[in-house]
Amino acid sequence: MRTEAQVPALQPPEPGLEGAMGHRTLVLPWVLLTLCVTAGTPEVWVQVRMEATELSSFTIRCGFLGSGSISLVTVSWGGPNGAGGTTLAVLHPERGIRQWAPARQARWETQSSISLILEGSGASSPCANTTFCCKFASFPEGSWEACGSLPPSSDPGLSAPPTPAPILRADLAGILGVSGVLLFGCVYLLHLLRRHKHRPAPRLQPSRTSPQAPRARAWAPSQASQAALHVPYATINTSCRPATLDTAHPHGGPSWWASLPTHAAHRPQGPAAWASTPIPARGSFVSVENGLYAQAGERPPHTGPGLTLFPDPRGPRAMEGPLGVR
């Protein structure tokens, strides 16, 4: 969900003007700028399909469009996982798949998408207006969730087009670790750009339509990303956006199995849309990550020696080794 802002094309100086060192120092800002642009805008899509053959059978597909590594996917129905929803399946990239009736078959389709077949009869049977949610816990983005359901008029065999992230939630995990490094890089980048502005401008290529111009524009940060550059370090994106089914592929587009969400151009958020929180104490990154697993009834992945995976009445020494073997 990246919006592209028109910013003046920053063109690098001609080779030889500032020498090899000058050229190298200008490569770094571009790399950092790219990281800043791509780091902050993951997206989750959800697609729900009722099977034509069995009216009580649904297929849910979810995907994560982000650069982070996925550590857990939770699929729930009846609402988001932490807000009254019931977990249907938990997919861990390393440990396997834990699923609850009426989930019949959950699978990884790719490294960033999953599918789940639901088959119900009686009380546990899904109905046409059920909301299905997918929550992706990833590093460094944090936890991102999207929900979708069949449109009321859906015929069996048709599907709702992919819903691009109606609910977006980045937990504290997403602003620590690598994000910290990126933010530091972004600050450093601004510093470099400011220095560059105050320096006597080197002779740039005069033509605005030079080959570098479109390339420079492609590097340009979105307004949302730019806003992120101006907010204090400890910010979390807690924006909730309504479902934008109309922005996805229309029914006349490619088949549902192959379809992917379009990048809907949402209004960029200004700093006011970001919630600022104090920087947590050292170690709370692990507890936040573990909270994601606890919500799904799961254990977090190995978090290193000496870290208790669940609260233990016997204190921090109660858990040592892979299974807490003493």
Partner: antibody
């Protein structure tokens, strides 16, 4: 070392219920889901269900949903499985098993099993 | 549920011989996220509880002799005992640990001649 202790045998009448126990030691009880597995004489293994001792959350094989109820007692680090409305089909050895965090459904540590005989 | 089928149901071998037993699953056990196969092998000696030998199709559990070799991918898997020993007399079960509910094969009984 990890140990799962189960009583050796239970003799129960048809139609009655039995509550099997599995006492865990040598690891943090809340850190691993506890599984229960059925083995009828000379036959294969069937997974009954699992319970997360940290929050009591359960997950059952559909086949055993109305037969088995899984619970835990934190104070004694013990997992329980209650089997109801017993018939001769329920005569089997029942194992508890826990895993070492590598995969959800590898059963790394097993109890010795409780032999349940349903007979009048 | 994923159905696991083992063959042969029994076999008799002499000490030192190479043993292979097969396990087939009704659907692929390959996790497309990490290209791992979620299949385990267990050994159950007479009067004992099962013991984990191999998981992720080919990873030996700690303390398991290296004569036990797991292989295969997708739906077809094999457990090989490169040089069978008298203490290997047991039932061997394969199990998919891909998803709920985990399911076991019917077992292969290994007898020593």
């Amino acid at each position: 070392q990890v140990q799962l202790q189960q009583p050796g045998a239970e003799l129960v009448k048809p139609g009655a219920s039995v509550k099997l126990s599995c006492k865990a030691s040598g690891y943090t009880f809340t850190s691993s889901w506890m599984h229960w597995v059925k083995q009828r004489p000379g036959q294969g293994l069937e997974w009954i269900g699992e319970i997360n001792p940290s929050d009591g959350r359960t997950n059952y094989n559909e086949k055993f949903k109305s037969k088995a109820t899984l619970t835990v007692d934190h104070s004694s680090s013990t997992a329980y499985m209650q089997l109801s409305s017993l018939t001769s089909e329920d005569s089997a050895v029942y194992y508890c098993a826990s895993n070492a965090d590598r995969a959800y459904y590898t059963m790394d540590y097993w109890g010795q099993g409780t032999s349940v005989t349903v007979s009048s | 549920d994923i159905v696991m089928t083992q063959s042969p149901s029994s076999l008799a071998m002499s000490v030192g011989q190479k043993v292979t037993m097969s396990c087939k699953s009704s659907q692929s056990l390959l996790n497309s996220f990490n290209q791992r196969n979620f299949l385990a092998w267990y050994q159950q000696k007479p009067g004992q509880s099962p013991k984990l030998l191999v998981y992720f199709a080919s990873t030996r559990d700690s303390g398991v002799p290296d004569r036990f070799i797991g292989s295969g991918s997708g739906t077809d898997f094999t457990l090989t005992i490169s040089s069978v020993q008298a203490e290997d007399l047991a039932d061997y079960f394969c199990q998919q640990h891909y998803s709920t509910p985990p399911t076991f094969g019917g077992g292969t009984k290994l007898e020593i001649k």
